[in-house]
């Protein structure tokens, strides 16, 4: 059974992941640039189910495409450094889901835009944090 300290650590990591995802979404929403239209043409795979920490495998598998899309947004008004950001998220995801997890991600049939993708994982984090609070 998880101890209160392990629960606290999990909650803190989920809060970090949530804030990082919110920061990305905020950066995109603030982005007034023709590149935004192009960013929205990229498609992301969505998890068929995302209710447990092991389902973060689905997010991990989409981090490389996410970094590639964010690289498009580089400008003086986009303050997220994609490589640092994705590296940070990857570390958190690995710690949360466990590096020894052998979960095979199942994806939904429909793909999503970067905004829909981020909103989905933000909701996932918020949902799990709510159960821990």
């Amino acid at each position: 059974a998880p101890t209160s300290s392990s629960t606290k650590k999990t909650q803190l990591q989920l809060e970090h992941l949530l804030l990082d995802l919110q920061m990305i979404l905020n950066g995109i929403n603030n982005y007034k640039n023709p590149k935004l239209t192009r960013m929205l043409t990229f498609k992301f795979y969505m998890p068929k189910k995302a209710t447990e920490l092991k389902h973060l495998q689905c997010l991990e598998e989409e981090l490389k495409p996410l970094e590639e899309v964010l690289n498009l947004a580089q400008s003086k008004n986009f303050h997220l450094r994609p490589r640092d950001l994705i590296s940070n998220i990857n570390v958190i995801v690995l710690e949360l889901k466990g590096s020894e997890t052998t979960f095979m991600c199942e994806y939904a049939d429909e793909t999503a835009t970067i905004v829909e993708f981020l909103n989905r994982w933000i909701t996932f984090c918020q949902s799990i944090i709510s159960t821990l609070t």
Partner: antibody, heavy 113, light 107 residues
Framework: QVQLVQSGAEVKKPGASVKVSCKAS????????MHWVRQAPGQGLEWMGI????????SYALKFQGRVTMTRDTSTSTVYMELSSLRSEDTAVYYC??????WGQGTLVTVSS | DIQMTQSPSSLSASVGDRVTITCRAS??????LAWYQQKPGKAPKLLIY???SLDSGVPSRFSGSGSGTDFTLTISSLQPEDFATYYC?????????FGQGTKVEIK
């Protein structure tokens, strides 16, 4: 104990820049992202942005985009907020807050010619 | 951006009164709502987080409720030190936004 200590009051002329510091102590600096909130005299609270203290990346409210820069120095557990092209309506108390339950004492920035 | 609307903007009450402040979000924010108390010249103080969880050290006369778009802060028996301005805040999505504040004054 956990605390955030901010730099002292500043008086600036329109068009100038101001840099406010916020020094954290009593907790692991990289564990909590730092937000900046401001409050104009007699007005409500306004979120300016957030910085990830571990990696240093930031996200700002659209209103401040292009004028605000948030940075951090992990060696001194200090976060900085710099606001440029100051105008009279930037006169406010600026607060840093870590995890929303710990706040700095506030820094009054007065912009006047 | 999510708009947060508080009511009333001010109220007068006496010590011992039950006081209720409401906050409405322009879209659903689940329970990602906090309440703060602020006294003149001081930083805001967190009272309630996650809509209904009392922050440590906050007296039990303060309570929060609600989810979705409608939220309430209740002070069951107003004390002299409770006269202040109260703000609600959503952290469901960026930008974080606050209500305009409710000033609780002595009747």
């Amino acid at each position: 104990q956990v605390q955030l200590v901010q730099s002292g009051a500043e008086v600036k002329k329109p068009g100038a820049s101001v840099k406010v510091s916020c020094k954290a102590s009593g907790y692991t600096f990289t564990d909590y992202y730092m937000h900046w909130v401001r409050q104009a005299p007699g007005q409500g609270l306004e979120w300016m942005g957030i910085i990830n203290p571990r990696a240093g990346y930031t996200s700002y409210a659209l209103k401040f985009q292009g004028r605000v820069t948030m940075t951090r120095d992990t060696s001194t557990s200090t976060v900085y907020m710099e606001l440029s092209s100051l105008r009279s309506e930037d006169t406010a108390v600026y607060y840093c807050t870590s995890g929303w339950d710990v706040w700095g004492q506030g820094t009054l920035v007065t912009v006047s010619s | 951006d999510i708009q947060m609307t508080q009511s009333p903007s001010s109220l007068s009450a006496s010590v011992g009164d039950r006081v209720t402040i409401t906050c409405r979000a322009s879209q659903s924010i689940s329970t990602w709502l906090a309440w703060y108390q602020q006294k003149p010249g001081k930083a805001p103080k967190l009272l309630i987080y996650a809509a209904s969880s009392l922050d440590s050290g906050v007296p039990s006369r303060f309570s929060g409720s609600g989810s979705g778009t409608d939220f309430t802060l209740t002070i069951s028996s107003l004390q002299p030190e409770d006269f202040a301005t109260y703000y609600c805040q959503q952290s469901y999505s960026f930008p974080v936004t606050f209500g305009q504040g409710t000033k609780v004054e002595i009747k």
